[in-house]
């Protein structure tokens, strides 16, 4: 969480941002909130990006003002106009690109004063893994697949029964470049698995950590997966 204060002759206002990560090809949100004003026409929101000449987005006098918008953001940004009055200056970003990563500044002017806060935005690719029993294999084998990751992640297997065991000798992980030549499909195979055990396939890069669990018994197979973004800090 980053909290910024204004430093002008006017009173300063508190502006709060949250560091976040964008998934390439998906839409992203750059979060920013501020002390609200009672008049929409008195609020100015400017989003800027370090190293970029034009503005990312500007909203003032109750409407978007994009005449100074940088080319890399054209047609890709929007504020939640109906939520500006309650202090939400968050920015929606369409079709996140690797090059959108960087330091952004959310700069606010209201009748109460000015304030700003920076936001670190990371970009990459992350997806939920799915673990299945590979019935085509000669021995009991598990296959963990996740369709889109970038940068290249690490894959670690764990088991509930053999806690702390190192499965690197009995697993094989491959990375296959997807058609857009950036993200990769992750496939990891674990051999010699035993019945009545829960196995976890953990995929992690510097942006996200995802886990796919599978519990294999003689009567059923249960699956569960979850994904967590790393380094979501507020400012």
């Amino acid at each position: 969480l980053i909290i910024g204060f204004g430093i002008s002759g006017r009173h300063s206002i508190t502006v709060t941002t949250v560091a976040s990560a964008g998934n390439i090809g998906e839409d992203g949100i750059l979060s920013c909130t501020f002390e609200p004003d009672i008049k929409l026409s008195d609020i100015v929101i400017q989003w800027l990006k370090e190293g970029v000449l034009g503005l990312v987005h500007e909203f003032k006098e109750g409407k978007d003002e994009l005449s100074e918008q940088d080319e890399m953001f054209r047609g890709r940004t929007a504020v939640f106009a109906d939520q500006v009055i309650v202090g939400n200056a968050s920015l929606r970003l369409k079709n996140v690109q690797l090059t959108d990563a960087g330091t952004y500044k959310c700069y606010i002017i209201t009748s109460k004063g000015k304030g700003n806060a920076n936001l670190e935005y990371k970009t990459g690719a992350f997806s939920m893994p799915e673990v299945n029993v590979d019935y085509n294999a000669s021995s009991e084998t598990l296959r963990c697949e996740a369709p889109r990751w970038f940068p290249q992640p690490t894959v670690v297997w764990a088991s509930q029964v053999d806690q702390g065991a190192n499965f690197s000798e009995v697993s094989n992980t491959s990375f296959e470049l997807n058609s857009e030549n950036v993200t990769m499909k992750v496939v990891s195979v674990l051999y010699n698995v035993t019945i009545n055990n829960t196995y976890s396939c953990m995929i992690e890069n510097d942006i996200a950590k995802a886990t796919g669990d599978i519990k294999v018994t003689e009567s059923e197979i249960k699956r569960r997966s979850h994904l967590q973004l790393l380094n979501s800090k507020a400012s």
């Epitope: 090809g25 003002e65 994009l66 005449s67 918008q69 940088d70 054209r74 047609g75 369409k94 058609s179």
Partner: antibody, heavy 119, light 107 residues
Framework: QIQLQESGPGLVQPSQSLSITCTVS????????VQWVRQSPGKGLEWLGV???????DYNAAFISRLSISKDNSKSQVFFKMNSLQADDTAIYYC?????????????WGQGTLVTVSA | NIVMTQSPKSMSMSVGERVTLRCKAS??????VSWYQQKPEQSPKLLIY???NRYTGVPDRFTGSGSATDFTLTISSVQAEDLADYHC?????????FGSGTKLEIK
Amino acid sequence: QIQLQESGPGLVQPSQSLSITCTVSGFSLTSYGVQWVRQSPGKGLEWLGVIWSSGSTDYNAAFISRLSISKDNSKSQVFFKMNSLQADDTAIYYCARDITTIVEGFAYWGQGTLVTVSA
Amino acid sequence: NIVMTQSPKSMSMSVGERVTLRCKASENVNTYVSWYQQKPEQSPKLLIYGASNRYTGVPDRFTGSGSATDFTLTISSVQAEDLADYHCGQSYSYPFTFGSGTKLEIK
């Protein structure tokens, strides 16, 4: 009330150029981009290009060599010019505006101007 | 270029029937698909944007769904005034592209 209105020549000689003006009201050209789309007789819609609030443009690669879009913010007018027209450029030409500043649907359309390319 | 393939090309339905129009993108377009209704001699009108968001004033019998490559426009109970051409379009990547349209006729 948001409105867009095209005005064009109707008839264009083969190999000549086409100029259409789109006059908008109810919104500012510094807030929203304006898209251009055409529809040939009995055919589907074809996206031609866009001019953004900043004045920068994006064109359909199939038309980039003969298409130019410009605007005058103060007059709320967008200018569309296409060169070297042939018979298969006969179509209704529309200007349109997106629903938001992110392109996710063309919510407002002009009435369209029918352009016939014929000697 | 992303190709948007619409099906069927045309269909004839009775008032009150349920209509399903399909649009398939040649590659992933996330949810950046919109649906338009075009009546004879009129400009297209936006029905659905963002794959599933009904535009202001559009009757709730029109519903959009889908993501990535497969999209559907459903008219739950077709009315006589729904006689029109229906177009899908993608605005995920340049050049923006449209399907060739579905002509809906009322029996």
